[in-house]
Interface confidence: low
């Protein structure tokens, strides 16, 4: 009497999450009777997975009628295949006893599971940094399957290489999850600029995912100050301009101070926008002369994102000079900076 | 909940043609193989005629080239055409399905009366 | 063709008796038998199958035994409920074929 084969003719199949997968077995006989079962690993811990015979198997359904007594085809389909669902599968032949007695097992077929990678999560620093610091951007991505992915990360299109990616876990698993780190160096323009993670996978046919991050989440440029002085007028009034620009975020406040006392406080908004994405903003002080005895010590403060305060200060002498002042620019653009403004009254 | 209900029978002339119909609602008819089993008056249980989930059909001999059995996926429903009725044909006729695992049947419809006589 | 063939054809008994039917195949079907349970004026009802098999909601009263050509059906315990016709079935290979049933009575 010929011995009982049975065929498991593939050694692995690979099918997309979400697909059904189809996992072949034939025997060479029916006799002896007993019945096919399938099960997912090898030993005692082996998992039942479908019984042609009896049971309750939902997401199992037989290939061929395996009610049909001259059928040798035990073919299984499983629909809906999770991750969860990869591992080794064997079908086996049993002879009908009590308990059911193991006659002849399959080779197996690996049944490995494609599943997609979730949309990439791009995440920047929790606190805004200047130009010419170096910020870290982080890119994740989970759920996939087989393991073999590429991150890329790009900057304004031009691909970044100060990454550094890891995929978990390091062993075997039924999926996996990517996480990278991008350094990104600021520039003022970076304004309007973007940070891509984009994530190839066997299951994309081609079309990476993306996930991205706008710089001006993470960037501040510190403003530029400049203080001008206009010529006096012929009513012994000087106007002083304060001009704050190349500034991002919006978020602004400028405070003139008289002598160390405030004079007036004012807030940024509704700035139009620089192509840069930067703002600018210009604030005038009117300093009557002829009302001082003394010298007048004008200070223009500007706190910006919560920052230190940023001040240019000048003095105005009151004394005997020319009534017209040509045009005095305080050129600095942090710390102190003090300009004499001479004002005559006669 | 699973349901097979028969209808189409009545009384027929020998010779005469009949066409049963079985809905089946709770199952997908065309995963399982499917039977018509019938019962004369006062006899016992006889099996009639089979198809299986590919199509593949089978008939007792006395049936043979007389009955046809085919179903219509879309409607969920079986059928058996019954030409050049005889009187030995006069039964209850019960649409049957055949379990998943071997074929063994496990629901029956109600039955429908079917009478040849002149 | 198989045929079945079912013994006896009529059996008296009492409520909360123990019964036993039979069935024998002309030739080998493995474990290919099933039992039905039929009432006047009703469809049958499956009760078992693959020789010792209940289908869902049968009453665990019944059981099968047997393989090859010979098998039987048990009801341990009968109840007024339980009298009715009984028929086994082979379903090896077509043509399936059915034993000349069994009438269960009221003694």
């Known amino acids: 009497e010929e011995e009982l084969q049975v065929i498991q003719p593939e050694k692995s199949v690979s099918v997309a999450a979400g697909d059904s997968a189809t996992l072949n077995c034939t025997v060479s006989s029916l006799i002896p009777v007993g019945p096919i079962q399938w099960f997912r690993g090898a030993g005692p811990g082996r998992e039942l997975i479908y019984n042609l015979k009896e049971g309750h198997f939902p997401r199992v359904t037989a290939v061929s009628d395996p009610t049909k007594r001259n059928n040798m085809d035990f073919s299984i389909r499983i629909s809906n295949i999770t991750p969860a669902d990869a591992g080794t599968y064997y079908c086996v032949k049993f002879r009908k006893g009590s308990p059911d007695v193991e006659l002849k097992s399959g080779a197996g077929t690996e049944l490995s599971v494609r599943a997609k990678p979730s949309a990439p999560v791009v995440s920047g620093p929790a606190v805004r940094a200047t130009a010419e610091h170096t910020v870290s951007f982080t890119c994740e991505s989970h759920g996939f399957s087989p393991r073999d992915i590429t991150l890329k990360w790009f900057k304004n299109g031009n691909e970044l290489s100060d990454v550094q990616t890891n995929v978990d876990p390091a062993g075997k698993s039924v999926s996996y999850s990517i996480r990278s780190t991008a350094r990104v160096l600021l520039t003022r323009r970076d304004v309007h600029s973007q940070v891509i993670c984009e994530v190839a996978h066997v299951t994309l046919q081609g079309d990476p995912l993306r996930g991205t991050a706008n710089l001006s989440e993470a960037i501040r440029v510190p403003p530029f100050l400049e203080v001008t002085q206009q010529s006096m007028r012929a009513d012994n009034q000087v106007n002083v301009t304060c001009q704050v620009t190349k500034f991002y975020p919006q978020r602004l406040q400028l405070t003139w101070l008289e002598n160390g006392n405030v004079s007036r406080t004012e807030m940024a908004s509704a700035l139009p926008e620089n192509k840069d994405g930067t703002y600018n903003w210009t604030s005038w002080l009117l300093v009557n002369v002829s009302a001082h005895r003394d010298d007048v010590k004008l200070t223009c403060q500007v706190e910006h994102d919560g920052q230190p305060a940023v001040n240019k200060s000048f003095s105005v002498k009151v004394s005997a000079h020319p009534k017209e002042q040509g045009s005095n620019t305080a050129a600095e653009n942090t710390g102190t900076n003090e300009r004499n403004i001479y004002g005559g009254s006669g | 909940e699973v349901q097979l209900v028969e209808s189409g029978g009545g009384l027929v002339q020998p010779g005469g043609s009949l066409r049963l119909s079985c809905a089946a609602s709770?199952?997908?008819?065309?995963?399982?193989?499917m039977h018509w089993v019938r019962q004369a008056p006062g006899k016992g249980l006889e099996w009639v005629s089979a198809?299986?989930?590919?199509?593949?059909?089978y008939y007792t001999g006395s049936v043979k080239g007389r009955f046809t059995i085919s179903r219509e996926n879309a409607k969920n429903s079986l059928y058996l055409q019954m030409n050049s009725l005889r009187a030995e044909d006069t039964a209850v006729y019960y649409c049957?399905?055949?379990?998943?695992?071997?074929?063994?049947?496990?629901?029956w419809g109600q039955g429908t009366m079917v009478t040849v006589s002149s | 063709d198989i045929q079945m063939t079912q013994s006896p054809s009529s059996l008296s008994a009492s409520v909360g008796d123990r019964v036993t039917i039979t069935c024998r195949a002309s030739?080998?079907?493995?474990?290919?038998a099933a039992w039905f349970q039929q009432k006047p004026g009703k469809a049958p009802k499956s009760l078992i199958y693959?020789?010792?098999s209940l289908h869902s909601g049968v009453p665990s009263k019944f059981s099968g035994s047997g393989s090859g050509t010979d098998f039987t059906l048990t009801i341990s315990s009968l109840q007024p409920e339980d009298f009715a016709t009984y028929y086994c079935?082979?379903?090896?290979?077509?043509?399936?074929?059915f034993g000349q049933g069994t009438k269960l009575e009221i003694k």
């Open positions: 709770g199952f997908t008819l065309s995963s399982y193989d």
């Open positions: 030739q080998g079907i493995n474990n290919y």
């Open positions: 079935q082979q379903y090896v290979s077509y043509p399936y074929t």
């Open positions: 198809i299986g989930t590919a199509g593949d059909t």
């Open positions: 693959t020789a010792s």
């Open positions: 049957v399905r055949g379990g998943v695992w071997d074929d063994a049947f496990d629901i």
